[in-house]
Amino acid sequence: EEELQVIQPEKSVSVAAGESATLNCTATSLIPVGPIQWFRGVGPGRELIYHQKEGHFPRVTPVSDPTKRNNMDFSIRISNITPADAGTYYCVKFRKGSPDVELKSGAGTELSVRAKPS
């Protein structure tokens, strides 16, 4: 059985303030069953940005239909980017459980925010 990998192809993404940012993430396997979550940062302050299964994230939308069978694209789009959104974002695969268990993290994508073009 091939080991699950979580791939974030871009090391960095630069977006102008007010635009949308697309953060790409794919998984190499559907197994084991469990959600993908997106976080900003690592350690104690790690901030939940998007949860595939629960929560309310008004500025974040999945790029691909998460309900589609065999979907392995977990990319997200964050709308109306501001300088406060800068940081390193991680796509993380969890195994379903109570609670869910973290399995594998992508390498991270650093989002930088450029000034709005005048």
Epitope: G41, G43, G45, R46, E47, L48, H56
Partner: antibody
Framework: DVQLVESGGGLVQPGGSLRLSCTAS????????MSWVRQAPGEGLEWVSA???????YYTDSVKGRFTISRDNSKNTLYLQMNSLRAEDTAIYYC???????????WGLGTLVTVSS | EIVLTQSPGTLSVSPGERVTLTCRAS??????IAWYQQKPGQAPRLLIY???SRATGIPGRFSGSGSGTEFTLTITSLQSEDFAVYYC??????????FGGGTKVEIK
């Protein structure tokens, strides 16, 4: 406005237990890391424990195995269960919201824990 | 563990003076330093993060600078409400997060 309100402090004997609570409002609690920071009388600040937005837990060495941090996202509440308390645990315990890059942007007013016989 | 050393321990100054507080780290922390102000009987308040970024609502007289292992907090013209204890905190290595011992700024 972000508000953090601690409760549960008090006087306890060495070896005893206490559970601190921190009720949060003004932000989406479940998405953010939360922490406990303490300050012994007349001393500086010491980070004690944290629970990240993913529910991972972290402790400073001196409390590992004695303190347990937990959270109830449905109640917007952070807890610190303190067991086997020692005199050196006497301090004001502050609840603080942790930013994504690990500093503290909002603090509660603190609750005093006194460990004495 | 990253150890932060603040100096001086106490600073006696007059209102209107310029004040510079120093925080030294035991190893490089890539500019990941925060500064807090604490007045007697109050909780700490975030002033500066990422060495030089002012937190929301913090007056322009507070500024931070530094890189590598040496960082400074400067208050350009000390106001009466600025007499307090100031702490630095590194947010580079979170195992564990550590604070400096504090600098007390008192009225001369």
């Amino acid at each position: 406005d972000v508000q953090l309100v601690e409760s549960g402090g008090g006087l306890v004997q060495p070896g005893g237990s206490l559970r601190l609570s921190c009720t949060a409002s003004g932000f989406t609690f479940r998405n953010y890391g939360m922490s406990w920071v303490r300050q012994a009388p007349g001393e500086g600040l010491e980070w004690v424990s944290a629970s990240s937005g993913s529910g991972s837990t972290y402790y400073t060495d001196s409390v590992k195995g004695r303190f347990t941090i937990s959270r109830d996202n449905s109640k917007n509440t952070l807890y610190l269960q303190m067991n086997s308390l020692r005199a050196e645990d006497t301090a004001i315990y502050y609840c603080a919201k942790v930013t994504w890059n690990n500093f503290f942007d909002y603090w509660g007013l603190g609750t005093l824990v006194t460990v004495s016989s | 563990e990253i150890v932060l050393t603040q100096s001086p321990g106490t600073l006696s100054v007059s209102p209107g003076e310029r004040v510079t507080l120093t925080c030294r780290a035991s190893q490089g922390i890539a500019g990941k330093i925060a500064w807090y102000q604490q007045k007697p009987g109050q909780a700490p308040r975030l002033l500066i993060y990422d060495a030089s970024s002012r937190a929301t609502g913090i007056p322009g007289r507070f500024s931070g600078s530094g890189s590598g292992t040496e960082f400074t907090l400067t208050i350009t013209s000390l106001q009466s409400e600025d007499f307090a204890v100031y702490y630095c905190q590194q947010h580079y290595d979170w195992s564990p997060l550590t604070f400096g011992g504090g600098t007390k700024v008192e009225i001369k």
